[in-house]
């Protein structure tokens, strides 16, 4: 029986070029967390395994950092990073819990200012 609930940061926004922490928290269950997957749409970003620790997908190694905790830090954000992110908690004996975060990456005010006052 799955009694737990996943709490997430929900809808969040960040500036282009900046960084953001994606956080999920599993509560209301005593189930053992064996692995947490972080995914963007259908792409695997990272895994935190209870035995093996963190594994970052090679294609995201430069821009993804593990933590804090079971969370994930996205760096050097681009507008293409806008979208849905999922934390997938594999637990025993409950099974699989999924949390959703929507990230919107905004053009920074500095970038807008720079574009408006460009030197020819």
């Amino acid at each position: 029986m799955m009694t737990g609930t996943i709490e997430t940061t929900g809808n969040i926004s960040a500036e282009k070029g900046g960084s953001i922490i994606l956080q999920c928290h599993l509560s209301s269950t005593t189930a053992q967390v064996t692995q947490v997957n972080w995914e963007q749409q259908d792409q695997l970003l990272a895994i935190c395994n209870a035995d093996l620790g963190w594994h970052i997908s090679p294609s995201f190694k430069d821009r993804v950092a593990p933590g804090p905790g079971l969370g994930l830090t996205l760096q050097s954000l681009t507008v293409n990073d806008t979208g849905e992110y999922f934390c997938i908690y594999h637990t025993y004996p409950d099974g699989t819990y999924t949390g959703r975060i929507f990230l919107e990456v905004l053009e920074s005010s500095v970038a807008e200012h720079g574009a408006r006052f460009q030197i020819p």
């Epitope: 799955m2 259908d42 395994n49 099974g95």
Partner: antibody, heavy 120, light 107 residues
């Protein structure tokens, strides 16, 4: 090439014990969770046990809990299943399977199986 | 336990046909479904994971779809080597459970 070779099956009387082995090669055994799955004479597949990559935790369905013990020797690249208090309903072909590192419920490679018959 | 009901239990089709096997879960399993192929006298092999993702080396004639409680495996342009029994498996909650299998034969 991933290779899993089971051994140790045979004929055993009800209440008896048997230890199955699975020799693994062609992959980094110590980095993968491993499972035993059985196929009944009626061709139904039943998950039997799973052990984590480092051996720190193991899981069982209620049907075998307390009677079967899964273990591993990462130095020898070998998976084991100790079966005791065997019943006629444990008669099956026992497969050793590797778990996909991304999604723990997926058995991505299987051995050829070893047959266990429980009969008086 | 989550029950996985597969249908049909057996089917016969001609080479080149497109066939569909369905798997119904007794409760919501999100996308946590795999399909396995077991050829006669052989061990099961992973075909599809997470509902629709093809395992390495699996031909694109195989496809999977669905979510929640209803799932399908579709094989297009049926080939002689597709003669096998196909099983679905859920990974939403323990114990992991399999469907009863669908035996595919060629007419």
């Amino acid at each position: 090439e991933v290779k899993l070779v089971e051994s140790g099956g045979g004929l055993v009387k009800p209440g008896g014990s048997l230890k199955l082995s699975c020799a693994a090669s062609g992959f980094a055994f110590s980095r993968y969770d491993m499972s035993w799955v059985r196929q009944t004479p009626e061709k139904r597949l039943e998950w039997v046990a799973t052990i984590s990559s480092g051996g720190s935790y193991s899981f069982y369905p209620d049907s075998v809990k307390g009677r079967f013990t899964i273990s591993r020797d990462n130095g020898r690249n070998t998976l084991y299943l100790q079966m005791s208090s065997l019943r006629s309903e444990d008669t099956a072909l026992y497969y050793c399977a590797r778990q996909d590192y991304r999604y723990p419920y997926i058995m991505d490679y299987w051995g050829q199986g070893t047959s266990v018959t429980v009969s008086s | 336990d989550i029950q996985m009901n597969q249908s049909p239990s057996s089917l016969s089709a001609s080479l080149g046909d497109t066939i569909t096997i369905t798997c119904h879960a007794s409760q919501n399993i999100n996308v946590w479904l795999s399909w396995y192929q077991q050829k006669p006298g052989n061990f099961p092999k992973l075909l599809i994971y997470k509902t629709s993702n093809l395992h390495t080396g699996v031909p694109s004639r195989f496809s999977g779809s669905g979510s929640g409680t209803g799932f399908t495996l579709t094989i297009s342009n049926l080939q002689p080597e597709d003669i096998a029994t196909y099983y679905c498996q859920q990974g939403q909650s323990y114990p992991w459970t399999f469907g009863g299998g669908t035996k595919l034969e060629i007419k």
